[in-house]
């Protein structure tokens, strides 16, 4: 079942999932100047069975200037550099991820996707928090949140994390080094 709300916001922290449970939606959103094509689902879906899960539907963006075409616009050098970095980071994280039954890995980027990925999680999903660069983690417990079903309502548990001060960012499970991106996470992996 879909979780009604987004995971809790922690000041000066971002979150991500290491793997996504079946039923998770990822909206097909595009960067400014582009829009998703009219055929195909408006989202990607983590689907499958207990032995193998994968993302169903592929997101595609088309130039909003050229109406009703699926012409792809070649990214500018800065965009290419940004995309390359994101792809590299995604690959690094994929290597770190353990294959969990009934879960999907981070989907690879699609051309001209929005800088922010919007996921809709399902009950049982865990997300992990880390402080953004320049802030230090004070843990009172696990820096994670789980979407749970209680009395027919979904709720996220409160992560026991405070971000304060000036030091290296903390790490997500399975990551040797903090990520190179400015906020400690590649943009494509953050959620609102």
């Amino acid at each position: 079942e879909l979780c009604d709300d987004d995971p809790p916001k922690i000041t000066h922290a971002t979150f991500k999932a290491v793997a996504y449970k079946e039923g998770t939606m990822l909206n097909c959103e595009c960067k400014r100047g582009f829009r998703r094509i009219k055929s195909g689902s408006p989202y990607m879906l983590c689907t499958g069975n207990s032995s193998h899960s994968s993302w169903d539907n592929q997101c595609q963006c088309t130039s909003s200037a050229a109406r009703n075409t699926t012409k792809q616009v070649t990214p500018q050098p800065e965009e290419q550099k940004e995309r390359k970095t994101t792809e590299m980071q995604s690959q690094m994280q994929l290597a770190d991820q353990v294959s969990l039954p009934g879960h999907c890995r981070e989907p690879p980027p699609w051309e001209n996707e929005a800088t922010e990925r919007i996921y809709h999680f399902v009950v049982g999903q865990t997300v992990y928090y880390q402080c953004v660069q320049g802030y230090r983690a004070l843990h009172r417990g696990p820096a994670e949140s789980v979407c749970k079903m209680t009395h027919g309502k979904t709720r996220w548990t409160q992560p026991q994390l405070i971000c304060t001060g000036e030091t290296e960012p903390s790490q997500f499970p399975g990551e040797e080094e903090p990520q190179a991106s400015p906020d400690g996470l590649p943009e494509s992996e953050t959620s609102r």
Epitope: L2, R35, K38, G40, S41, T47, D56, N57, R192
Partner: antibody
């Protein structure tokens, strides 16, 4: 909690226009496509079109091109649908609906009558 | 446009029974189908997305299935609160289209 608030009813004269509002709360308005649906007894549900407030992009069902115009005001998190050259055929309940995950407003009952 | 056909306009059932509402698309829509429940005087409530995944708060008595062109919403152990009209919707290709609806009546 996601909410899409619409006026309950509108009564307008034939040949005029009407602008129906849909005020969104409980989510980031600019990040989601918002659609409009027409419901008439005996005609079922019809998708009119949708708008992406973050970029102002719109899609229209060919059937409603020239009839409906979709806009959005990001400062007030409100979407609008203007219907022009109204006739009795436009009398219906109009719903605004977030596309994914789906969430619908309560609907506005439009009556076109002289 | 993709035409969605719900051949049964009305279905009659009893409390505790199991009932299946069906929906047929004029062309392959994958699993890009949603099911809605609409009670008199209310707006449609989303029950199912991607043919078989439930929205939160939807009892597990309601199950969606199917892919391609044929889809089914099954309600097991029917309760009086299930009295409503059920619509399916395809969102595989624009414009998104709906079935004509199936009214569930409780005997």
């Amino acid at each position: 909690q996601i909410q899409l608030q619409q006026p309950g009813a509108e009564l307008v004269r034939p040949g005029t226009s009407v602008k129906i509002s849909c005020k969104a709360s409980g989510y980031t308005f600019t990040n989601y496509w918002l659609g409009w649906v027409k419901q008439r007894p005996g005609h079922g549900l019809e998708w009119i079109g949708d708008i992406y407030p973050g970029g102002g992009y719109t899609n229209y069902n060919e059937k409603f091109k020239g009839k409906a115009t979709l806009t959005a005001d990001t400062s007030s998190s409100t979407a609008y649908m203007q219907l022009s050259s109204l006739t009795s055929e436009d009398s219906a309940v109009y719903f605004c609906a977030r596309v994914t995950p789906a969430s619908w407003g309560q609907g506005t009952s439009l009556t076109v009558s002289s | 446009d993709i035409v969605i056909t719900q051949s049964q306009k009305f279905m009659s059932t009893s409390v505790g029974d199991r009932v299946s509402v069906t929906c047929k698309a004029s062309q392959n829509v994958g699993t890009n189908v949603a099911w809605y429940q609409q009670k008199p005087g209310q707006s449609p409530k989303a029950l199912i997305y991607s043919a078989s995944y439930r929205y939160s708060g939807v009892p597990d008595r309601l199950t969606g299935s199917g892919s391609g062109t044929d889809f089914t919403l099954t309600i097991s152990n029917v309760q009086s609160e299930d009295l409503a009209e059920y619509f399916c919707q395809q969102y595989n290709r624009y414009p998104y289209t709906f079935g004509g609806g199936t009214k569930l009546e409780i005997k």
